[in-house]
């Protein structure tokens, strides 16, 4: 090989050992029979050399550094050439370095031809290994602007006082152009400006200078985003740290088109703006740090650019001003993560503060809009507390458990609407009366409606789930001893059409001791399946529940149990079932941990089924399923 560098070229070539590898044989650069592991060629020198091994690319790297001095004379602006040409260089991994020194008052602009650059974070590498490393200068200190690959959005980087640009090319890469040019600009009065151009939908991840180390003290860095007019941009901070400020405050500032409050100033911990139309700037401003304990300021953020949906231009009013103790959350429904680019899905408050989830609270009117490619990716969860503190005031008071129409009009599916019903302990109980009689969901007769009511205890220490109930059954009311949560859960978008079927009234009633009482009026046409609360986990210890089963005058009810035995094993106490005729008060008592369950039996009159649990042994719980059917009384069954 022969490398000759012209005297005025300001180019230095250095061939040196690369990352040490566990290669058995050493390799040398051979210069007139002399073996060496490093070769430096300066301007005006011409050197002939060879390598002592077949694959020097496994051992050596070549660095070609060109110093460009803009202090003492005019700057050679324009497209930057790879000199010497790659075809004249040995087949090694090569790094071309351009070190430009300029006055503080001069701005330097690096312009990247298409494909533009994509910034990578620590530990990431570029496919194919072509990497740009860009540094700036503050007085004598070198500041890393970032490491970049091809195929991104970064089109220009402006700096002042100098720039060091390194282009790393692996030995096998055919590239023979630098891919960038240098232009002079007026002073930018900050560390740097990075321009990021979006042609269409996509995202860009960007980082503050020196990331993941600290951003230089009291410096200013700006990103300019060029966004097509028909698209919208949203900013989210992926990672940030704040330093310890002595004076001034670290912040980000946005220049947003159409904003009357430019610049809009945000703390790094604030929700960042979204749904922005048109070009915008984002600037990171550092502070004067505490000399003893400076900490570090750093920021990694993402800009997501996507099509606005029809919904993003619509404003929805959610009026919770007349609601009390209510919170509404719009959030992403859980999905499997995909590796493809997925446009963001945001909900925006007042069209500007956009985030992946949003919680609205009662007492106000809220204006929201959406920036989302597909609103089925979101759902709503609402919680409302209805509590009674004074039993004298609440007794016999009723509340309607209905989803407010404002919520139903939103273009997002309702997932859960939960009412937490709280009563004074041992003073009052609750009764739930549905607008339409309810069916209990069982494996044997599942609910197939678009929504169900999930009823569970709301006492933290108590694990008691009464069951899931949907309209279209035989349960006329559910009485519960103490605090419960009633959750209306939807299962299909058709809930909006069926919303008229919802409707549950809760009333505060005098206290009673049983955990729950179900009032059932069976339908003549179908079996009524009923099961004990906490199905599959077992009725809690020492819990008592009852079913008040009405039998119409002209009918006979057949009560059938699913199993011959309950399988419950009591650790302490006994588990009982009492079946009592309501008219005659005649009752039969069955020991559930000893006796077989009764065979199918007929009741001519309304009757009670009461189940009281013992303290069961682990794994030997009390679960009971039974059903009631009606037949006309004309058949003589006596």
């Amino acid at each position: 090989f022969e490398i000759a560098l012209p005297r005025e070229s300001n180019i230095t070539v250095l061939i040196k050992l690369g990352t040490p590898t566990l290669l058995a044989k050493p390799c040398y650069i051979v210069i007139s029979k002399r073996h060496t592991t490093m070769l430096s060629i300066k301007p005006g020198e011409r050197i002939l050399f060879t390598f002592s091994c077949q694959s020097p690319e496994n051992h050596f790297v070549i660095e070609i550094q060109k110093n460009i001095d803009c202090m003492s004379g005019p700057c050679p602006f324009g497209e930057v050439q790879l000199q010497p040409s790659t075809s004249l260089l040995p087949t090694l991994n090569r790094t071309f370095i351009w070190d430009v020194k300029a006055h503080k008052s001069i701005g330097l602009e690096l312009q990247f031809s298409i494909p533009r650059l994509r910034q990578i974070g620590p530990g990431e590498s570029c496919p194919g290994g072509v990497t740009y490393s860009i540094s700036g200068r503050i007085d004598a200190t070198v500041v890393r602007i970032g490491t970049f690959c091809s195929n991104g959005t970064v089109s220009r980087i402006k700096m002042q006082e100098g720039v060091k640009m390194a282009l790393h090319l692996p030995w096998f890469h055919p590239r023979n152009v630098s891919g960038f040019s240098i232009a002079n600009r007026s002073s930018i009065k900050r560390l740097c400006i990075i321009e990021s151009v979006f042609e269409g939908e996509g995202s860009a991840t960007l980082m503050s200078a020196n990331y993941p180390e600290g951003f230089p003290e009291d410096e200013l860095m700006t990103w300019q985003f060029v966004i097509p007019a028909h698209l919208r941009a949203s900013v989210s901070f992926l990672n940030f740290n704040l330093s310890n400020c002595e004076r001034k405050e670290e912040r980000v500032e946005y220049y947003i088109p159409g904003s009357t409050t430019n610049p809009e100033v945000f703390k790094l911990e604030d929700k960042q703006p979204g749904n922005m139309a048109g070009n915008f700037n984002l600037s990171l401003q550092g502070c004067d740090q505490d000399a003893q304990n400076p900490g570090i300021l750093r920021l990694q953020f993402q800009v997501l650019v996507q099509h606005p949906q029809n919904e993003s231009n619509k404003i929805y009013v959610v009026d919770l001003s007349n609601e009390r103790a209510t919170s509404l959350t719009i959030e992403p429904r859980p999905v499997k993560q995909s590796r493809k680019f997925v446009p963001g899905c945001f909900v925006c408050l007042e069209s500007r503060t956009c985030s992946t989830n949003l919680t609205l609270t009662s007492g106000s009117k809220h204006k929201i809009s959406f920036l989302c490619d597909n609103l089925t990716r979101l759902w709503m969860n609402v919680e409302k507390n209805i509590s009674c503190t004074d039993h004298r005031y609440c007794q016999r008071k009723s509340y309607s458990l209905q989803v407010p129409s404002d919520i139903l009009h939103l273009p997002v599916e309702l997932h859960d609407f939960s009412w937490k019903l709280l009563v004074p302990k041992d003073r009052l109980s609750l009764v739930l009366v549905p607008a339409q009689k309810l069916q209990q969901h069982t494996h044997e007769k599942p609910c197939n409606t678009s929504f169900s009511y999930l009823v569970a205890s709301a006492i933290p220490s108590q694990d008691l789930y009464f069951g899931s109930f949907c309209p279209g059954g035989s349960i006329e009311q559910i009485q519960v001893k103490q605090n419960i949560s009633v959750t209306l859960r939807t299962f299909a978008p058709s809930f909006r059409q069926e919303a008229s079927r919802q409707g549950l009234t809760v009333s505060f009633i005098p206290y009673f001791k049983e955990e729950g009482v179900f009032t059932v009026t069976p339908d003549t046409k179908s079996k009524v399946y009923l099961r004990t609360p906490n199905w599959d986990r077992g009725l809690p210890s020492l819990t008592s529940v009852s079913w008040n089963i009405s039998v119409p005058r002209d009918q006979v009810a057949c009560l059938t149990f699913f199993k011959e035995r309950t399988g419950v094993v009591c650790q302490t106490g006994r588990a009982f079932m009492i079946i009592q005729e309501q008219r005659t008060r005649a009752e039969e008592i069955f020991s559930l941990d000893e006796d077989a369950l009764p065979k199918p039996r007929f009741h001519h009159h309304s009757f009670w089924v009461n189940i009281s649990n013992c303290s069961p042994a682990s794994g030997k719980q009390l679960d009971l399923l039974f059903w009631v059917t009606l037949t006309p009384r004309t058949v003589d069954l006596t």
Epitope: F51, Q54, S55, E57
Partner: nanobody
Amino acid sequence: QLQLVESGGGLVQPGGSLRLSCAASGSDVSANGMVWHRQAPGKGREWVAVISSSGSTNYADSVKGRFTISRDSDKNTMYLQMNSLRPEDTAVYYCGVAHYGQTYWGKGTLVTVSS
């Protein structure tokens, strides 16, 4: 003098497969890195895949998951298995080897993907 000869090119329908070979003669290249480049009509040369002497591989994004580079050191030969071919894969494919700091190239083989 080290020489490289590519073979295996031809006309194939989109979605089809081809296997290119690159035979080296004049020197043992088992300890050398080898590479495939391609040049589409009217375009610049682009890197496709590379294989080191130890057998580690790297692919351009445009072919990742579709092309596989391999080598048979005993036969002094490198291969490029190309599956799920697309019209944009149409190009002259060149193989190269890094040998004593020089890159030696073959004359190329034409791959045409068309229906």
